[in-house]
Structures are given as C-alpha cells and as structure tokens.
C-alpha cells in the first residue's frame, strides 16, 4: 500500500482501537477520547491534560451533542489538525510561496 | 512520532508533493490531482482512469468552483474515503456490533 493509503488505514484503525473499549463500540466516549488523545496525539494535547481541557475538546468535537464522538466527528477533528499542520508547513520560510 | 501523528504528516506532505508542481503551489490543479490519485491512491481509483472519471472527481472535490483543490477540500475528500473504509471496517463479520 502507498503511504497515503496506509495513513487512511491508521486513521480508521486508531479510532476502533479506542472506540471498542466501552459503551457503543463505534463511538468514542470521553474516557476513550482522552486515552486516544493522550496516547496517539500527545503533540496536539501538549500540556492541556486537566479535566476541563478534555471536556472542552470533547464538546468541540461532539457536533451532534450526544456526549460521544462518532467517526465523522473524528474525521472533522483530524482534518482540523491537518489544516493546522498545513498552515505551519505553508508558513515555513523554505516553503515560501513562489511563482511557478 | 506516533502512527496517527505520522499519518497526519503524510496527509500534509503528500498534498504538497503534488500541489507544488505547477500553478498555485498550495492548490492541486486537475493534472496534479490526477497524478496524486493515480500514484498515491490507486486503490481508490481502481479502473476509473478515463478522463471523464477524473473530471467527475475534480468537480466533486472543488467545492468553491475555482477549478483547483485546496487543502481543505483535499481533507474533506480524504475524510470521505476514510468514512468509506470505516463503513467497510464496521461491516466486517468479525467486527459485528456487540453489547459491551
């Protein structure tokens, strides 16, 4: 598989690695989300490990307000992180826009 | 870096690997998109390599109708593919919903 295909596989498998632990096996509850963020995206969380920070992340992701994060909401979240990474990438001096 | 963080890096770097080839270096034109899909997502395209198929994909991704695919549109596209992969994943017999 090509790296981008593998990346998509990782996105799917990581979700299910945590969503399957308790409750609805196809959704992340707060405990599962917390574990996923802490273990799989430590660079995103940084030092924000207090309870209120997790609650805020959960609330921001939970667009249908069911106290869980489904796969679509998770994808929107990862897209947001990717877009932040992309802004950093585009802002690097050696990546400065050039006329092509 | 954790696998999920690496996956996000791959998503960003793959976009720029192709968007930087011609025109606006932060957007994929039709030629760049075609090359990205053919080389990086062959399993998505399958046998749909005719011009009309590419036009259709391009049209579906280009939500702001500027004949180019920006990073946000690309993320939406990858999210859709991830969601298709996820539906397949959830539909597997060994992944059948279970009461937990």
């Amino acid at each position: 598989a090509r790296p981008l295909e593998e990346a998509l596989d990782v996105i799917v498998s990581t979700f299910h690695k945590y969503s399957g632990k308790e409750g609805d096996k196809f959704k992340l509850n707060k405990t599962e989300l917390k574990e996923l963020l802490t273990r799989e995206l430590p660079s995103f969380l940084g030092k924000r490990t207090d309870e209120a920070a997790f609650q805020k992340v959960m609330s921001n992701l939970d667009s249908n307000r069911d106290n869980e994060v489904d796969f679509q909401e998770y994808c929107v979240f990862l897209s947001c992180i990717a877009m932040m990474c992309n802004e950093f990438f585009e802002g690097c001096p050696d990546k400065e826009p050039r006329k092509k | 870096a954790r696998p999920l963080e690496e996956a996000l890096d791959v998503i960003v770097s793959t976009f720029h690997k192709y968007s930087g080839k011609e025109g606006d270096k932060f957007k994929l034109n039709k030629t760049e998109l075609k090359e990205l899909l053919t080389r990086e997502l062959p399993s998505f395209l399958g046998k749909r390599t005719d011009e009309a198929a590419f036009q259709k994909v391009m049209s579906n991704l280009d939500s702001n109708r500027d004949n180019e695919v920006d990073f946000q549109e690309y993320c939406v596209f990858l999210s859709c593919i991830a969601m298709m992969c996820n539906e397949f994943f959830e539909g597997c017999p060994d992944k059948e919903p279970r009461k937990k």
Epitope: G23, K30, A52, Q55, K56, S59, N60, N67 | -
Partner: antibody, heavy 120, light 107 residues
Framework: QVQLQESGPGLVKPSQTLSLTCTVS?????????WNWIRQHPGKGLEWIGH???????NYNPSLKNRLSMSRDTSKNQFSLKLSSVTAADTAVYYC?????????????WGQGTLVTVSS | DIQMTQSPSSLSASVGDRVTITCRAS??????LNWYQQKPGKALKLLLY???RLHSGVPSRFSGSGSGTDYTLTISSLQPEDFATYYC?????????FGGGTKVEIK
C-alpha cells in the same frame, strides 16, 4: 459572573417573524460553549428550541426546524433567533441560555426570559 | 424524542423536611440528567448535572442519584428559599427535553 439578557418585541402579529437577540456579558463569547434558546408556554413546561456553537454548528428542535433560523455575532457577544410564520401557539417566555461543556451539557446560565405574545 | 416524566407534579412540605422528586426517561439516558430550580420572575438555576454533580454555589443539601431511566433529586432538609419549581432535563441526545416540573409548596 456570566449574564445573559434577551431583547426583542413583546408583541408579534400572527404569520410574522419573531426576532430575539441575546447579549452575553461577563464572559467572552467563546467556542467552548453552545448558546441556546428555550421557551416556556404560559403555565407550562420548558421546550428546547435550538442552539449555536462550535464553528457555527447549529442544531434545531425538529418540531420547529422549518421555521427557525439562528445566528451569532461574536464581535457583539450576541446570538439571535428568528421564528417565522408565528401563531398563538408560539406565545411563550423565551429564554437564552449557555450550555456548558461538562458531561450532559447542562444549561449553566440563563437569561431572565422575555415574554413574547402572538396576537393581532 | 426522549420523553421525561416527573413526579409528583406538586407537593406540600415543611421547612426541615426531606423531599424527593423523581424523573423517568423513556429510554436509557446514561446518567446525562440535569436538574434546575425555577422561582417566579427569576432566571432558572442549574442545581445538578450528570445525575449527581453539584453545580458551583449550590448547597450540599441538594443531591441526585439514579441510572438508566430512573433518577431522583433529594433535598435533605428543606429551607425557606427552596420553595420553587424543579425540572429535570436529559442531556443524552438532541432534541433536549425537560420533565413537566414539580412545584414544591409550603404546607
């Protein structure tokens, strides 16, 4: 201390559009909260109307969805409600509330409420 | 929609009494149950969220319990300022729904 204040006309004619605004003070109008409208018919219980929140995400009560519109103006710390084609059944006290990000998303702050009467 | 049924609809009690109000949901709401107090002409107040968590500034005489579909609000020793109407509300799913209310009156 967070304070919410509803404003708008107290009397609306049938078939017209009810427009209300809620002004939030004492707290920045951040993405961490959802901002709700709830109503209470005279002598009756409470009915959730809808809310607006993170990234402009909006959810409406399906029973009112086709007549509802919500928006927000972060620069003014305000959010608003528009309910079209009103009838006498829309006569109620309308409350704006803040929805916390804690488990179960409770409404932790409420406005005093404003009575809207639909009558010709 | 999830239906919330509160009982009793009203009750008479004296200062110092222990008061219990129950709330039943039409389906499992996984402890996402909130309680509010309403006094005439005043803004509603959040008392408890997630079944039993006390909102800041709420006296400890208020407590909550329950799971699944059945929940309870208890006032251990009724005070003069507690005479009001109480509402339960489910935060499990949209649309949010409330119980019909319980009016606590002076005996």
């Amino acid at each position: 201390q967070v304070q919410l204040q509803e404003s708008g006309p107290g009397l609306v004619k049938p078939s017209q559009t009810l427009s209300l605004t809620c002004t939030v003070s004492g707290d920045s109008f951040t993405n961490d909260y959802y901002w709700n409208w709830i109503r209470q018919h005279p002598g009756k219980g409470l009915e959730w109307i809808g809310h607006i929140g993170y990234g402009g995400n909006i959810n409406y009560n399906p029973s009112l969805k086709n007549r509802l519109s919500m928006s927000r103006d972060t620069s003014k710390n305000q959010f608003s409600l528009k309910l079209s084609s009103v009838t006498a059944a829309d006569t109620a006290v309308y409350y704006c509330t803040r929805e916390s990000f804690y488990d179960g998303y409770p409404f932790d702050y409420w406005g005093q409420g404003t009575l809207v009467t639909v009558s010709s | 929609d999830i239906q919330m049924t509160q009982s009793p609809s009203s009750l008479s009690a004296s200062v110092g009494d222990r008061v219990t109000i129950t709330c039943r949901a039409s389906q499992d709401i996984r402890n996402y149950l909130n309680w509010y107090q309403q006094k005439p002409g005043k803004a509603l107040k959040l008392l408890l969220y997630y079944t039993s968590r006390l909102h800041s500034g709420v006296p400890s005489r208020f407590s909550g319990s329950g799971s699944g579909t059945d929940y309870t609000l208890t006032i251990s020793s009724l005070q003069p300022e507690d005479f009001a109407t109480y509402y339960c509300q489910q935060g499990n799913s949209l649309p949010r729904t409330f119980g019909g209310g319980t009016k606590v009156e002076i005996k």
